[in-house]
């Protein structure tokens, strides 16, 4: 699906004090989906404020969400899926704003783990292979992955790598001898649903062979 | 209520261009999408493309791409959809319709008839 | 593209019996629980109306006669006691992949 291409104008300026963002995980506990927001500016007072979600939902009209600290959080298997959910920030029964969003547009997925890299020394490359649990989901079972890795000494420089699968090979000619690297992962969904990034996965660290002086290949 | 009101009648001659408005009122603008389809005589539907009001964001059918650009005024909650190097065979029923959902149409303009003929 | 087959492309049907429309898809249109098939209503000379979307989800304002089931690649529109007002062309649609792409139409009449 092609979804929208930008023209580079500017999100609906619905900036007043009580802007806030979503995302929803579907399947994140079993067959229950959640949905968690928050508001864009750290610093407003929730004390009274409070987020419910009406329309696109199965057998209830509305649901409220449950305060965790400065987030607004809501787990549940009544998400229709298809359809604009209205979100609001209330004060008792005053809507200060709200929000049409397509629960679908905003998933975030789970982050990949068990992140590993090995060498294998006959074929001079390192195999990547990472997992996650979205190959167990019914619903976004499809996405894309951003590898990116850096020589640990180089701050910024990181290269990314967009794969659908869980396997990469880097080639060793590629990277740094005898170098210290930082490899870590993250997903988005890329069929039907969309999204944002998950979290990055925790990194792993290993470190390239030394050249083989004599052979001009590493060790 | 929610309304989508299309601009009038058109004929065109072949190779020229036709911009169709659909003016929508009744609910938020920026909150849903406004697509285009269109019905030539006696046949069926075919979805042209659509356009998310709220960041400009355009998505067109393949078949159209290059000949067909779909624009949004907020000041006037309008949407236009223009339609280059016409041809007889663009001759339809054009309609602008709102997306309920990804990718349903809940509401529905009366349609602007575009005659293209020399 | 995604295909679309309806039928039969006409139907005659008494006043007050059933009416059943199929929707056939080239490739499934169906995440799991998520039916992306929607079917309309298009009287002569009028706009399309929504009918059912999501498969089975009956909008609003319709009346409980019309139905709908299905997934995968298959889907059904039921009108379950058909009235002289649903004299109309009906049409699905599927919205799981760009070109979203409709059926051919099934025209129902009163016998």
């Known amino acids: 699906e092609s979804g929208y291409a930008q023209n580079g104008d500017l999100e609906d300026a619905e900036l007043d004090d009580y802007s806030f963002s979503c995302y929803s995980q579907l399947e994140v506990n079993g067959s229950q989906h959640s949905l968690t927001c928050a508001f864009e500016d750290p610093d407003v007072n929730i004390t009274n404020l409070e987020f419910e979600i009406c329309g696109a939902l199965v057998e209830v009209k509305c649901l409220n969400f449950r305060k965790l600290q400065e987030i607004y959080f809501i787990e549940t298997k009544k998400f229709l899926l298809i359809g604009k959910s209205n979100i609001c920030v209330k004060v008792g029964e005053k809507s200060l704003t709200c929000k049409k969003i397509d629960l679908t547009t905003i998933v975030k997925p789970e982050a990949p783990f068990d992140l590993s890299v090995v060498y294998r020394e006959g074929a001079n490359d390192f195999v990547v292979t990472f997992n996650t649990s979205h190959l167990q989901k019914k619903y976004v079972k499809v996405l894309m992955h951003d590898v990116a890795y850096r020589q640990e000494k180089d701050e910024n420089k990181w290269t990314h790598v967009n794969l659908s699968s869980t396997k990469l090979t880097l080639l060793q000619r590629k990277l740094q001898p005898a170098a210290m690297y930082e490899i870590k992962v993250r997903s988005i969904p890329d069929h039907y649903f969309k999204g944002f990034w998950s979290e990055w996965s925790p990194s792993y660290y290993f470190r390239t062979p030394e050249i083989n002086n004599s052979s001009g290949e590493m060790d | 209520q929610v309304q989508l009101v299309q601009s009038g009648a058109e004929v065109k001659k072949p190779g020229a261009s036709v911009k169709v408005s659909c003016k929508a009122s009744g609910y938020r603008f920026t909150d849903y999408e406004l697509h285009w389809v269109r019905q030539a005589p006696g046949q069926g539907l075919e979805w042209m493309g659509g356009?998310?009001?709220?960041?400009?964001?355009?998505a067109y059918n393949q078949k159209f791409k290059g000949r067909v650009t779909m624009t949004s005024d907020r000041s006037t909650s309008t949407v236009y959809m223009e339609l280059s190097s016409l041809r007889s065979e663009d001759t339809a029923v054009y309609y602008c319709a709102r997306s309920g959902g990804r990718w349903y149409f809940d509401v529905w303009g009366q349609g602007t008839t575009v005659t293209v003929s020399s | 593209d995604i295909v679309l087959t309806q039928s039969p492309d006409s139907l005659a049907v008494s006043l007050g019996e059933r009416a059943t429309i199929n929707c056939r898809t080239s490739?499934?249109?169906?995440?799991?629980?998520?039916?992306?098939m929607h079917w309309y209503q298009q009287k002569p000379g009028q706009p399309p109306k929504l009918l059912i979307y999501?498969?089975?989800n009956l909008e609003s304002g319709v009346p409980d006669r019309f139905s709908g089931s299905g997934s995968e690649t298959d889907f059904t529109l039921t009108i379950s006691s058909l009235q002289a007002e649903d004299v109309a062309v009906y049409y699905c649609?599927?919205?799981?992949?760009?070109?979203?792409?409709f059926g051919g139409g099934t025209k129902v009449e009163i016998k």
């Open positions: 356009i998310d009001p709220k960041t400009g964001g355009t």
């Open positions: 490739e499934s249109v169906s995440i799991h629980l998520l039916h992306l």
């Open positions: 999501g498969a089975s």
């Open positions: 649609q599927q919205s799981i992949k760009d070109p979203y792409t």
